[in-house]
Interface confidence: low
């Protein structure tokens, strides 16, 4: 009897589906893997006979649930499917987005580009399949624990008046209202004010 | 919200040829996968044909050499020619789209975001 595969789970992030499992032990040999996906009540192969523990899914619609399912095989034996269940468009995990700073005087100057969806054209980001898209930025000053969180209306935002020659971090994650759904932060970015460009009186 | 409308079915003799056409709103991208599918009374929905954003085709074994799907980008308009009709053409055809590439690995999977009302084609003896 072959062992089906083990810990089987969907490690999504912008759309890149790659179901991973374990291979389970197995005394008389190694152990090759096919998975499918549910495709209007038809079983599609998707990955056959791999030595691999994955496989990417990443082009399955991100709209519906998706049945998907992965068994061990070994010559003329195999074992029972393992099945999953996976809705991209509510279970794919939102990557950091990409933020660009720029110190001007007392202001921090930010844009914001939201993550490209894995697999598909170079244009094509998370804000055009989540209508709902938008932003959180949260930013404090260097060295305390106070944050303070703002949700930009654009791809950019200023942050203005800051204390002059004073360190800021800066972070950003999309965030989707409709779903009360967040995204993963980015890495903080910090830089250093300059001098206020307010004329003396 | 796209929307997806389909025209251009009829009845036609065996033999005889028909374009359909799908109208695509609520979106300006070009790089949908789009797919013609159809229905016969009483049988799965089945994938006809496929065409990504590039512009790479797809046929069911059933269609090829008869059918040919195309897309206007500037009209946002989807269209299969088909000729040689055959009785088993018989369905009801739906025009799909999805914000995604088209699977290669299938012919045309049904797992489509969006789909139009669709639109009857006879092919009678």
């Known amino acids: 009897m072959v062992p089906p595969p083990e810990n089987v789970r969907m490690n999504s992030v912008n759309f890149k589906n790659i179901l991973q499992w374990e291979s389970p032990a197995f005394a008389k040999g190694n152990l090759t893997f096919t998975a499918q996906y549910l495709s209007y009540r038809i079983f599609q192969d998707k990955c056959m006979n791999t030595t691999l523990t994955e496989c990417d899914f990443s082009s399955l619609s991100k709209y519906g649930d998706h049945t998907l399912r992965v068994r061990a095989e070994f010559a003329d034996e195999h074992s029972d499917w393992v099945n999953i269940t996976f809705c991209p468009v509510d279970d794919t995990i939102i990557g950091p987005p990409g933020m660009q700073v720029e110190v001007l005087a007392d202001s921090l100057h930010m844009r914001f580009l939201a993550p490209k969806i894995e697999n598909e054209y170079e244009t094509w980001t998370m804000k055009n399949v989540y209508n709902s898209w938008t932003y959180n930025v949260q930013y404090w000053k260097n060295g305390t624990d106070e944050k303070f969180q703002i949700t930009p209306q654009y791809d950019f935002e200023v942050l203005r008046n800051l204390e002059p020659w004073t360190t800021y971090c800066v972070q950003v994650r999309g965030f989707l209202p409709d779903r009360n759904k967040a995204g993963e932060w980015s890495e903080p970015v910090c830089e250093q004010t300059t001098h206020d460009e307010t004329v003396p009186s | 919200q796209v929307q997806l409308q389909e025209s251009g079915g009829g009845s036609v003799q065996v033999g005889g040829s028909l374009r359909l056409s799908c109208a695509a709103s609520?979106?300006?991208?070009?790089?949908?996968?789009m797919g013609w599918f159809r229905q016969a009374p009483g049988k799965e929905r089945e994938g006809v044909a496929t065409i990504d954003g590039d512009g790479s085709t797809r046929y069911a074994d059933s269609v090829k050499g008869r059918f040919t799907i195309s897309k206007d980008n500037a009209k946002n308009t989807l269209y299969l020619q088909m000729h040689s009709l055959k009785p088993e053409d018989t369905a009801m055809y739906y025009c799909?789209?999805?914000?995604?590439?088209?699977?290669?690995?299938?012919?045309?999977?049904?797992?489509?975001?969006?789909w139009g009302q669709g639109t009857q084609v006879t092919v009678s003896s």
């Open positions: 609520g979106y300006t991208y070009s790089n949908y996968c």
């Open positions: 799909a789209a999805d914000f995604a590439l088209c699977d290669p690995t299938v012919v045309a999977h049904t797992d489509f975001g969006y």
